[in-house]
Amino acid sequence: SCNTATCVTHRLAGLLSRSGGVVKDNFVPTNVGSEAF
């Protein structure tokens, strides 16, 4: 699995989209590591 910053950003965007944005406020690319996925 890709763990670069850009991959993490795109995966997080997909997760936010699927969840309707209902996640905790600090769930942003610079706060989460690849292990969050």
Epitope: T4, C7, T30
Partner: antibody
């Protein structure tokens, strides 16, 4: 509106250093990584590295280790790239870029900073 | 480092035509490829990410395909404003690397 505003053109002497700035606005600066990219005249793009504005962590392209130093100033939402021991090979346009999710999912680039190194 | 090869440096097309720009990675990068458009004197503008997903505001004339090592950017119904250089980029592995670019010329 998301904007990345870079500092103006620089004319530098060989052997000196220069610090280029990239001021972010329109989004939460600390939420998204900042990338730096080099484009030599008439050539392709080279990724220099990225910085996490939340904690200052950096990842560099090995080619630019020792040449570029990436830093951030959270208080002014500004990213910096310092280039040292300048040579004519460093003459190029340098871009900052960041992929944001909120307010808009997009890959934003600064307008570019032209660096000319000449004696 | 992963090498991204855009074998065609120049491509010529006519307004209304369809054109495909290709990009080959030296090793498997999954779908972790982006495409950029750079008009003369301007900064690169992001078009696609994850090989085939358009960023907000990018016309649906721009489509992407591919995975692994072979990727394609297709521009349908070419407009005069599409005159630009197109770059692919892989972000699967550090350091991120770009293709050499393909300049699109309008006949």
């Amino acid at each position: 509106e998301v904007q990345l505003l870079q500092s103006g053109p620089e004319l530098m002497k060989p052997g000196t250093s220069v610090k280029i700035s990239c001021k972010a606005s329109g989004y939460t600066f600390t939420d998204y990584y900042m990338n730096w990219v080099k484009q030599s005249h008439g050539k392709s793009l080279e990724w220099i590295g990225d910085v996490n504005p939340n904690n200052g962590d950096t990842t560099y392209n090995q080619k630019f280790k020792g040449k570029a130093t990436l830093t951030i100033d959270k208080s002014s939402s500004t990213a910096y790239m310092e280039l040292r021991s300048l040579t004519s090979e460093d003459s190029a346009v340098y871009y900052c870029a960041s992929i944001t999710i909120v307010p808009l999912y997009f890959d934003f680039w600064g307008q570019g900073t032209t660096l000319a190194v000449s004696s | 480092d992963i090498v991204m090869t855009q074998s065609q440096k120049f491509m010529s097309t006519s307004v209304g035509d369809r054109v495909s720009v290709t990009c080959k990675a030296s090793q498997n990068v999954g779908i972790n490829v982006a495409w950029y458009q750079q008009k003369p004197g301007q900064s690169p503008k992001a078009l696609l990410y994850s090989a085939s997903y358009r960023y907000s505001g990018v016309p649906d004339r721009f489509t992407g395909s591919g995975s692994g090592t072979d990727f394609t950017l297709t521009i349908s119904n070419v407009k005069s404003g599409d005159l630009a250089e197109y770059f692919c980029q892989q972000y699967n592995t550090y350091p991120y690397t770009f293709g050499g670019g393909t300049k699109l010329e309008i006949k």
